[in-house]
Interface confidence: low
């Protein structure tokens, strides 16, 4: 498992809530947490860091303390849309597909 980092300081405040620190690498676009160190996925996303799209669902329902909207994610033509790279990997487009740059300790096409 990747390292968990706990930060006690309140970095920003919103409605007097002290946000929790999610698992390192948890997707900022598709993940959230309710306990420190966890990474829970919005609908339509899966994987340990919520970076893998679920092909059977294209809708997402943002949850968590700052949710404001609900909508459907329509996958675009870009191979990196939704970031197919797991575990904090970084996606770059190639002519026919995508390439993941994996953080230390992770390997494979999608850093899994």
């Amino acid at each position: 498992d990747h390292h968990h980092h706990h930060h006690e300081q309140k970095l920003i405040s919103e409605e007097d809530l002290a946000p929790l620190v999610c698992r390192a690498g948890c997707s900022p676009e598709h993940g959230f947490c309710e306990q420190p160190g966890e990474c829970r996925c919005l609908e339509g996303w899966t994987g340990p860091l919520c970076t893998v799209p679920v092909s059977t669902s294209s809708c997402l329902s943002p949850r968590g303390p700052s949710s404001a909207t609900t909508g459907c994610l329509v996958p675009g033509p870009g191979p990196c849309d939704g970031n197919p790279c797991a575990n904090g990997g970084s996606c770059s487009e190639t002519p026919r597909s995508f390439e993941c740059t994996c953080p230390r300790g992770f390997y494979g096409l999608r850093c899994e």
Epitope: H5, H7, L11, I12, P28, D81, G88, T101, P103
Partner: antibody, heavy 120, light 106 residues
Framework: QVQLQQPGAEFVQPGSSVKMSCKAS????????ITWVKQRPGQGLEWIGD????????KSSEKFKNRATLTADTSSSTAYIQFSSLTPEDSAVYYC?????????????WGQGTTLTVSS | QVVLTQSPAIMSASPGEKVTITCSAS?????IHWFQQNPGTSPKLWIY???YLASGVPARFSGSGSGTSYSLTISRMEAEDAATYYC?????????FGGGTKLEIK
């Protein structure tokens, strides 16, 4: 509190090299990408590249790939960008940025920027 | 490469006026992020993930859009809103910014 500290200014001569620093504090430096952004006087923002300090992995714009070198020292929580063969066109403000996120929150922290002046 | 085109490049608005700045992407992106920059200062994250206001951003700001068309709206312009606004996409490499919209107060 998440902070990125950058030197205010660097003055160098054309043809020389420069290494600018970005010292991070207040978060797990190794686990979040650092981005470098260039802004020429009166111009817009230009993405240079990203570095993942935990592994040293980098992604750079084709324009800067051969001229800018991104590195990070996890022991001092400092990211660096080094330019070689400087020209006056490299004169700009260079920002480092950390996208730090947790829960449904983004905390996108920018350094104050280093103003690089390349002049003889 | 995803090219982001902002319009207008420069605009002015009177206090209380509704303002809309658009950001058009050359191909579909998942989200757009908006930054505000005042002269001589670092850009600040203003709206993230298309529609979420960053901490401290007044509620008169809003963001919307999907696919290739995004916008930032100010319901009622105030003097402190005068600044340059940039959109950015992080869906693919290379990361790209829009050219910026300079918003002035009349």
């Amino acid at each position: 509190q998440v902070q990125l500290q950058q030197p205010g200014a660097e003055f160098v001569q054309p043809g020389s090299s420069v290494k600018m620093s970005c010292k991070a504090s207040g978060y797990a430096f190794s686990d979040y990408w650092i981005t470098w952004v260039k802004q020429r006087p009166g111009q817009g923002l230009e993405w240079i590249g990203d570095i993942y300090p935990g592994s040293g992995s980098t992604k750079s714009s084709e324009k800067f790939k051969n001229r800018a070198t991104l590195t990070a020292d996890t022991s001092s929580s400092t990211a660096y960008i080094q330019f070689s063969s400087l020209t006056p066109e490299d004169s700009a403000v260079y920002y480092c940025v950390s996208l730090y996120y947790y829960g449904s929150y983004y905390l996108d922290t920018w350094g104050q920027g280093t103003t690089l002046t390349v002049s003889s | 490469q995803v090219v982001l085109t902002q319009s207008p490049a420069i605009m002015s608005a009177s206090p209380g006026e509704k303002v809309t700045i658009t950001c058009s992407a050359s191909s579909s992106v998942t989200y757009i992020h908006w930054f505000q920059q005042n002269p001589g200062t670092s850009p600040k994250l203003w709206i993230y993930r298309t529609s979420y206001l960053a901490s401290g951003v007044p509620a008169r700001f809003s963001g919307s859009g999907s696919g290739t068309s995004y916008s930032l709206t100010i319901s009622r312009m105030e003097a402190e809103d005068a600044a340059t606004y940039y959109c950015q996409q992080r869906s693919s490499y290379p990361r790209t910014f829009g050219g910026g919209t300079k918003l002035e107060i009349k």
